[in-house]
């Protein structure tokens, strides 16, 4: 799917828009809000009843090159006694983000936007029970 | 910027880092993944730290619709279906990259923007601070 060109009069192309070759778009990768920091509660990944670990994936042909992925530590959830309760399930929570992919075709380079699914953390859910007929 | 490995036979004039501005193909790779979390899973209702999903819409951004999670309770749902305040529901937040039209209203000119979204909620043991 292409990025929508919104058709409202609100989106009449202003004179100040830069010229762009057909089939492509101009993308400034100097990130707005680059220095904002996540203010999540302290070490929730360890305090959660569905704890998780983080791993960093690295790809030099991707911008940003570093993407952090979470993995649930358990199949079940941790109960009040600190034991795994397999009557409940730890499940991953995922979120899409955009990255810029750099592609080498011979000596020429092209850039492609890509949607990446990131696992952000885990939550504890009641399982869906499927009964056999 | 990021250092990129180059074909050794290519001219040396190519910049090893990502340039500040790039021309990008309008088609997005992996674009067909489901962007509506209500349709992709029902974890938001089945979780012991359930959440509501609020639609955040901005036509100057791509994607224009982002779903924000808000924890339904301060406590967590226990085995009896009651809200137990011995545990706390907290949002799981994630920085994501989106496209911001720049200059505003331009159809094919964007800048990357980092935004913080609450994706869902998880149940945690609270940190208790007693008064001395």
């Amino acid at each position: 799917r292409k990025i929508p060109k919104v058709g409202h009069t609100f989106f009449q192309k202003p004179e100040s828009c830069p010229p762009v070759p057909g089939g492509s778009m101009k993308l400034d990768i100097g990130i707005i809000n680059e220095n904002q920091r996540v203010s999540m509660s302290r070490n929730i990944e360890s305090r959660s009843t569905s704890p998780w670990n983080y791993t960093v994936t690295w790809d030099p042909n991707r911008y940003p090159s570093e993407v952090v992925q979470a993995q649930c530590r358990n199949l079940g959830c941790i109960n009040a006694q600190g034991k795994e309760d397999i009557s409940m399930n730890s499940v991953p929570i995922q979120q899409e983000t955009l990255v810029v992919r750099r592609k080498h075709q011979g000596c020429s380079v092209s850039f492609q936007l890509e949607k990446v699914l990131v696992t952000v953390g885990c939550t504890c859910v009641t399982p869906v029970i499927h009964h056999v007929q | 910027g990021i250092t990129i490995p180059r074909n050794p036979g290519c001219p040396n004039s190519e910049d090893k880092n990502f340039p500040r501005t790039v021309m990008v193909n309008l088609n997005i790779h992996n674009r067909n993944t489901n962007t509506n979390p209500k349709r992709s899973s029902d974890y938001y209702n089945r979780s012991t730290s359930p959440w509501n999903l609020h639609r955040n819409e901005d036509p100057e951004r791509y994607p224009s619709v982002i779903w924000e999670a808000k924890c339904r309770h301060l406590g967590c749902i226990n085995a009896d279906g009651n809200v137990d305040y011995h545990m706390n529901s907290v949002p799981i937040q994630q920085e994501i990259l989106v496209l911001r039209r720049e200059p505003p209203h331009c159809p094919n000119s964007f800048r990357l923007e980092k935004i913080l979204v609450s994706v869902g909620c998880t149940c945690v043991t609270p940190i208790v601070h007693h008064v001395a």
Epitope: - | N52, R72, L74, N82, V83, V131
Partner: antibody, heavy 121, light 112 residues
Framework: EVQLVESGGGLVQPGGSLRLSCAAS????????VHWVRQAPGKGLEWVSV???????TYNSALKSRFTISRDNSKNTLYLQMNSLRAEDTAVYYC???????????????WGQGTTVTVSS | DIVMTQSPLSLPVTPGEPASISCRSS???????????FHWYLQKPGQSPQLLIY???NRFSGVPDRFSGSGSGTDFTLKISRVEAEDVGVYYC?????????FGQGTKLEIK
């Protein structure tokens, strides 16, 4: 206009039971949490229980074994079933709406006028 | 249970003068999500309580701007910049961070 009207109070003997009602109008009970709060004569406020928009509940553990909160969405009415009543349960009982829906403040923004429960032999 | 302690319990004030009520909780009211669920209510004579301030410092709709709330953690304050005759009643602090939700014992504001 948001309105909460309590009823069902009265004189009851120790050990007896009573069911209080709170009729809500101007909003839907399946969109907001609603609390019961009581006030003994000449005393301060004491929180009793809440039923949240999704039907889950939270109780004051000191009262949970004797009091049960429930609601009927079709009547948009909240209930408090009180059993094994004691003299110390004598109070004005208020229902109060929680701000929770979409706002997530967890405060009580609209209160009923209260219904008086007297437990005496 | 969280104990909420208000002071003073009685507050005689001259109209037009400022007033201040303190409330201290026995435990921090900061939730794991970083927010503080501390509120102020006013119960006017013969009436039901009404919400004045929610989440420490936010005035509820229709509440005059002479009322302000502040504080953090365990110590909170309600200030009235210029008391008016209609402000008389009992002021209660409250917390909904921890269950059971609790109220302070109340501060009775009266006009001198």
């Amino acid at each position: 206009e948001v309105q909460l009207v309590e009823s069902g109070g009265g004189l009851v003997q120790p050990g007896g039971s009573l069911r209080l009602s709170c009729a809500a109008s101007g909003f839907s009970l399946d969109s907001y949490g609603v609390h019961w709060v009581r006030q003994a004569p000449g005393k301060g406020l004491e929180w009793v229980s809440v039923i949240w928009s999704d039907g889950t509940t939270t109780y004051n553990s000191a009262l949970k074994s004797r009091f049960t909160i429930s609601r009927d969405n079709s009547k948009n009415t909240l209930y408090l079933q009180m059993n094994s009543l004691r003299a110390e349960d004598t109070a004005v009982y208020y229902c109060a709406r929680d701000t929770h829906y979409r706002l997530y403040y967890y405060a009580m923004d609209y209160w009923g006028q209260g219904t008086t429960v007297t437990v005496s032999s | 249970d969280i104990v909420m302690t208000q002071s003073p319990l009685s507050l005689p004030v001259t109209p037009g003068e400022p007033a201040s009520i303190s409330c201290r909780s026995s435990q921090s009211l900061v939730h794991s999500n970083g927010d503080t669920y501390f509120h102020w209510y006013l119960q006017k004579p013969g009436q039901s309580p009404q919400l004045l301030i929610y989440k420490v410092s936010n005035r509820f709709s229709g509440v005059p701007d002479r009322f302000s709330g502040s504080g953090s953690g365990t110590d909170f304050t309600l200030k009235i910049s210029r008391v008016e005759a209609e402000d008389v009643g009992v002021y209660y602090c409250s917390q909904t961070t921890h269950a059971p939700f609790t109220f302070g014992q109340g501060t009775k504001l009266e006009i001198k």
